[in-house]
């Protein structure tokens, strides 16, 4: 029950996170005009990953897309790429996790398959969240660098006569949406990975007891070969009772009535 809840919650959290990453990627307010300590202008500038906008005091807003690909800064291209990779991985992760949900029955899918799918989607969510966080952080760093550069050149005098005010940009709403969404996707992915452990079919590591018959005398030798842990062809009906939590040194094998011929 706890596993189902963890998996379900992980899915929902990731879903919200990915929706947030998509929203952040589409938002125009990645950077907004800094109004603090700036001459007050009757226009407000803000920029996104795909277009820049200007809002006049009347409320009239005009947006222009970045119609060039080669003319854009490499950092902006990198941020776009990170966000898109995050969205794609997240979307695939969501698709995989739907089929992996314990509460959904699809044919005769074994728990081991569901566990693998849950782990896969969990890893995808983690990478997706990291991509979004990285993308937003790269953009934020770019803004901080440009902010201090434009502060240093706030007023660039033209022949000492005319002053040109440089527009400074600060963090826009999309950055915060992106950070939160990336974090949620990451948390959702971790929850899916935790749920995967509980979904895995339980198997026991039987402790093999070997014995050597030299001539007519029977010698018992404890702690021989360890049983296969589940990837071989001889593991079909094995059960794991100790979950592999203890080492061979910690668990001593004692002879039972089945150990002797």
């Amino acid at each position: 029950m706890a596993v189902t809840a963890c998996q379900g919650l992980g899915f929902v959290v990731s879903l919200i996170g990915i929706a947030g990453i998509i929203a952040a990627t589409c938002m125009d307010q990645w950077s907004t005009q800094d109004l603090y300590n700036n001459p007050v202008t009757a226009v407000f500038n803000y920029q996104g990953l795909w277009r820049s906008c200007v809002r006049e005091s009347s409320g009239f807003t005009e947006c222009r897309g970045y119609f060039t690909l080669l003319g854009l800064p490499a950092m902006l291209q990198a941020v776009r790429a990170l966000m898109i990779v995050g969205i794609v991985l997240g979307a695939i992760g969501l698709l995989v996790s739907i089929f992996a949900l314990k509460c959904i029955r699809i044919g005769s899918m074994e728990d081991s398959a569901k566990a693998n799918m849950t782990l896969t989607s969990g890893i995808m969510f983690i990478v997706s969240g990291l991509c979004a966080i990285a993308g937003v952080s790269v953009f934020a760093n770019m803004l901080v660098t440009n902010f201090w550069m434009s502060t240093a050149n706030m007023y660039t005098g033209m022949g000492g006569m005319v002053q040109t005010v440089q527009t400074r940009y600060t963090f826009g709403a999309a950055l915060f949406v992106g950070w939160v969404a990336g974090g949620l996707t990451l948390i959702g992915g971790v929850m899916m990975c935790i749920a995967c452990r509980g979904l895995a079919p339980e198997e026991t590591n039987y402790k093999a007891v070997s014995y050597h018959a030299s001539g007519h005398s029977v010698a018992y030798k404890p702690g021989g070969f360890k049983a296969s842990t589940g990837f071989g062809s001889n593991t079909k009906n094995k059960k794991i009772y100790d979950g592999g939590a203890r080492t061979e040194d910690e668990v001593q094998s004692y002879p039972s009535k089945h150990d002797y011929v």
Epitope: N45, V54, S57, R64, V162, T164
Partner: antibody, heavy 120, light 113 residues
Amino acid sequence: QVQLQQSGAELARPGASVKMSCKASGYTFPTYSIHWLKQGPGQGLEWIGYINPNTIYTNYNQKFKYKTTLTADKSSSTAYIQLSSLTSDDSAVYYCAREGYGRGNAMDYWGQGTSVTVSS
Amino acid sequence: DIVMTQSPSSQTVTAGEKVTLSCRSSQSLLNGGNQKNYLTWYQQKPGQPPKLLIYWASTRESGVPDRFTGSGSGTYFTFTISSVQAEDLAVYYCQNAYFYPFTFGAGTKLELK
């Protein structure tokens, strides 16, 4: 058609206050900001400030901040300007003007003006 | 505050003549976000309120004759009347529509020769 009808001329004593009105018609009043401007006799134009009737947000020219109060009444589609502590320097024609939408913050329609004379 | 300087303060013209008025601002009125100049031109005839002619430095308001044109960028702007008509005799103001408080030039008065 868009019209801004301003109240009649005012004659006031120094130290008194006057309140002028600007009634808008022909458009949705709260959608557009109303600017107020002053033009002294034989002088140029001075921007006093503006009010957004929808949000009641005001933006004043610091020079007129303590002299004027801008208000608006959505129900009657009317904007008001109040001048306090009048002096002879306040004698001028006061205009209200509508800020155009998508007009680069320009004022596209103007009232006919209200003449204020401060005299003892 | 932004200082708007207009020249000449007055100009005597004859009908049909081409007239160019200039306006200079103390700071650039060019907005980098949309590459538009927030400069406006108004015409004011005696006893009348100002009338909007040009906004965004070069965009003509609807209903304004095409003999009126605006140009310039940054801090220097010009206003041209290609062929002056008798009804064009008025005072022309340029206005900073970018920085608060909005400021106007002292105006250029067009007079008939």
